[in-house]
């Protein structure tokens, strides 16, 4: 096992005058030299002391010495003004040795018994220093048996002399455009035996300015220039200093972006040091003049390297670099004294020519062609056939550059076709019906594609029809030939439309009855609405009040007439609604399967027969007049009926449209 520390042999003992405890003889001289190990001292005290008293202890005495220093000369029994007796005092050697000398002269007036003393070695506490004496250690002193050691505060390192703390004050780099630096501990005395290096390193283009502030106190010499402690300032151009003494050095304008400050101290002295406040300057950039209708921020007396400004435009004006818009603009001053980008303009916001409104027009209110900030335009829809959807059509050019409605909308208003307009006032008949005149059924659509069928225009790009009429084309929508705006089935004069997609009700099952016999065709283009092409209205919630039993509806189409041929001219018939139970009963008997008539169907026709829709009319609309709105709406879709059209006791069966309003609205809004 490793050996522990080797403790010194104990040093202790007793001293006494010759013959003690008896009286001592005359003319005696006795000397003891006591030695303790290094780092220890000797402690001595008397348990008995009885010597002849004499002036300044000239006759008999005990003298204690440590090295060259006399610690005490003792005589008598008790101390007087000029003589000292040990009493209960304890005496300590200054180092590790103590000399004790006993002397008696040639005579004693009476017998004296001398002295007895005890001594022992004890550790010296080197960290305890007498007032006024230099401390053992610069910072922290640590005593231990037989010695001591020094340590330093954070930021310092112990010098090789093992007592002085040198400052760790090199390698500090200052990169801010201004700041302060000072000698370590300023304004307290700076540390000894230190070499400090401070660097100020700014971006190229800056010039450092040094100002010495508050006080300056660096050890100096009357004849030699700063031989002890000094401060030097070095730039890439020149060296300034050395500086010492008590006078604040003058401002130094370095004309450099890098500065090295060196501060060196020796082992002695007690001086407070120095403090530098540094700033920087650079070549100023031209003063930024705000463009018209703009302002500069921040406003400064001058702008130098790295300073920046932003331009903000007044409301209704926008930042532009030529034709290109900017959301924000900030310029930065460069080292050569120029701005890194040119000043933009604050141009009045121009919303540009407003977009064309399909089936409508736009009017400049503020002035012809005026499209700048706060300009007003008015959209309107083509009268009679179109109406504007929830919008007053007034738009203002706002600061964001968009035409904006009074409700804050930036999208165009919508011109919706007016629905349910008809030139017709009285009824007629189809199977046993009457010829339609122009404008009577402007929603009527002729669907060709395998068979002849019909449909009704909804809005300006949808057709409502029967599922069974377009079932075969559901996957080939483009095969449907859709014609409108004509009365004659074979006329070459019609408006052509093409299908983009066919949507058959998911509840419809082909060849298994006619429940949910409803479909929508989306047109690939909007059709232009006019007196001959106008959509039919969808029923309002209140529409059922116009579709009670015996209320009259009108069906139209080019289906089979009484002659057994497809009609050349569009035909129509006015027919009453039949009681639902009556109709259900009519189709309960063979050859019709039970449950043929469902709640999704309505029936119309005369019990006596003769007025009915027929093959070729499928998908066409059974329409009713809403007397409140004076608009025609679709109540039913021609779906199915008896084998022989217009048969007595049988009725035409129509898809009940009011049951499908949510389905229709969902399809139209989704697609």
């Amino acid at each position: 096992t490793p050996l522990g520390p080797k403790w010194p042999e104990p040093v202790f003992g007793r001293l006494a005058s010759p013959g003690f405890p008896g009286e001592y003889a005359n003319d005696q001289e006795r000397r003891w030299t006591l030695t303790a190990p290094p780092g220890y001292r000797l402690r001595l005290y008397f348990t008995h002391f009885d010597l002849e008293l004499s002036h300044l202890c000239e006759y008999d005495f005990v003298k204690l010495s440590s090295g060259a220093k006399v610690l005490a000369t003792l005589c008598g029994q008790e101390s007087t003004d000029t003589e000292r007796a040990p009493g209960k005092d304890t005496f300590y050697s200054l180092g590790s040795s103590l000399d004790i000398t006993f002397r008696s002269d040639y005579s004693n007036e009476k017998p004296f018994t001398g002295f007895e003393a005890f001594y022992a070695a004890e550790d010296i506490d080197e960290c305890q220093v007498a007032p006024g004496e230099a401390p053992t250690c610069d910072h922290h002193c640590h005593n231990h048996l037989g010695g001591f050691y020094c340590s330093c505060r954070a930021g310092y390192v112990l010098h090789r002399n093992k007592r002085t703390c040198s400052a760790l004050c090199s390698g500090q780099v200052f990169t801010q455009r201004s700041g302060e630096l000072s000698s370590p501990e300023y304004p307290r005395p700076y540390p000894k035996l230190s070499s400090c290096t401070y660097s100020i390193s700014l971006e190229e283009g800056f010039s450092v300015i040094l100002d010495f502030v508050e006080s300056f106190d660096v050890e100096t010499h009357p004849e030699t220039l700063c031989p002890y402690d000094f401060l030097k300032i070095q730039t890439d151009r020149e060296e300034h200093g050395p500086f010492c003494g008590k006078t604040l050095p003058h401002r130094i304008e370095t004309k450099s972006n890098t500065v090295t400050i060196t501060f060196v101290t020796d082992e002695s002295g007690d001086h407070t040091g120095w403090k530098i406040h540094y700033t920087s300057t650079a070549q100023p950039c031209p003063y930024p003049m705000a463009p018209p209708n703009g302002h500069v921020s921040p406003v400064q007396a001058k702008y130098i390297l790295k300073d920046s400004f932003s331009i903000f435009c007044e409301t209704g004006y926008e930042l532009l670099q030529g034709h290109l818009p900017l959301k924000s603009f900030t310029a930065v001053c460069q080292k050569d004294g120029s701005w890194d980008r040119p000043m933009p303009a604050c141009s009045i916001v121009d919303c540009g020519p407003p977009d064309d409104l399909p089936s409508g027009r736009v009017e400049y209110i503020t002035g012809p062609g005026v499209t700048t900030y706060k300009a007003v335009i008015q959209y309107s829809c083509e009268e009679t056939f179109y109406t504007m959807k929830v919008n007053d059509g007034k738009y203002v050019c706002e600061a964001d550059g968009f035409w904006t409605s009074s409700k804050g909308e930036k999208s165009l208003p919508v011109c919706e076709p007016v629905c349910g307009l008809s030139a017709r006032t009285t009824g007629g008949q189809i199977y046993g019906g009457q010829k339609a005149k122009p404008g009577d059924f402007p929603w009527q659509v002729l669907i060709l594609g395998g068979t002849t069928a019909a449909g009704a225009l909804l809005y300006d790009n949808w057709v409502l029809t029967a599922a069974h009429a377009v079932y075969e084309q559901k996957h080939d929508a483009s095969a449907l030939d859709i014609r409108m705006g004509t009365l004659k089935r074979l006329s070459p004069h019609y408006t052509q439309a093409w299908s983009e997609a066919v949507f058959i009700h998911e509840g419809y099952t082909h060849d298994a009855g006619f429940d949910n016999d409803i479909a929508l065709i989306k047109l690939n283009n909007k059709v232009v609405i006019n007196s001959n092409i106008t959509p039919i209205c969808l029923p309002r919630k209140e529409a059922e009040s116009f579709m009670r039993t015996d209320d009259i509806g009108t069906a139209s189409g080019w289906g089979l007439t009484q002659r057994g041929f497809l009609a050349r001219n569009l035909m129509y018939v006015d027919i009453p609604i039949v009681d639902h139970q009556k109709c259900t009963a009519a189709y309960e008997k063979p050859p019709y399967p039970r449950g043929s008539v469902t709640a999704n169907m309505l029936c119309a026709g005369l019990e006596s027969g003769g007025k009915d829709s027929c093959r070729g009319d499928s998908g066409g609309a059974l329409v009713f007049l809403d007397s409140e709105t004076e608009r025609w709406f679709v109540g039913g879709i021609v779906s199915w009926g008896s084998m022989n059209c217009g048969e007595a006791g049988q009725y035409g069966v129509y898809t009940k449209v009011i049951n499908y309003i949510p389905w229709i609205e969902n399809i139209i809004s989704d697609f």
């Epitope: 670099q321 030529g322 034709h323 290109l324 818009p325 900017l326 959301k327 924000s328 980008r341 040119p342 540009g352 964001d400 550059g401 968009f402």
Partner: antibody, heavy 114, light 107 residues
Framework: QVQLQESGPGLVKPSETLSLTCTVS?????????WNWIRQPPGKKLEWMGY???????SYNPSLKSRITISRDTSKNQFSLKLSSVTAADTAVYYC???????WGQGTLVTVSS | EIVMTQSPATLSVSPGERATLSCKAS??????VAWYQQKPGQSPRALIY???YRYSGIPARFSGSGSGTEFTLTISSLQSEDFAVYFC?????????FGGGTKVEIK
Amino acid sequence: QVQLQESGPGLVKPSETLSLTCTVSGYSITSDYAWNWIRQPPGKKLEWMGYISYSGRTSYNPSLKSRITISRDTSKNQFSLKLSSVTAADTAVYYCSRHYGDYWGQGTLVTVSS
Amino acid sequence: EIVMTQSPATLSVSPGERATLSCKASQNVGTNVAWYQQKPGQSPRALIYSASYRYSGIPARFSGSGSGTEFTLTISSLQSEDFAVYFCHQYNANPLTFGGGTKVEIK
């Protein structure tokens, strides 16, 4: 680092609509600037087609105004070009760029041919 | 529209020599002019904006000047990588327009 990348079909039939998308990384198209579409027919000079600004406003070259639409999808940080009724004269390398051209896409060749 | 006319169409220069490229606008465009370098099969590379402001990363040998209708791009000492086509571009007014380009080739 700001990067722009064009994408879309390299071949379009006459009379159809040319559609291209520019995906921007390293910068939000709503933060600032104008975002341009520029094209260069083979052996010819560059032609500015239009831009969409940080706010969503558009500006088009009048020579293309009836056929061009520039839109954006801010959630994907993309802006798009649609050019309708194309002809062989629309065959070009199409570039997207930022503002006055500090960043460009690598370009994509679109050929109009049946 | 504003027409940007570049001259010469081709400039033959030896490496190390100075090249001066001209661009004239058909009407006043202020300083709203940019210059680009384009090499075959590559997209244009921005050199100068606002007539005289060099983009960061562009070597100091490239400099731009001019305002109003006359603009110049100067390459003080041509390096081998500088041989390319150079375009000027005005962004002062709609439509933004480009010059036809100047091809700088090795003499």
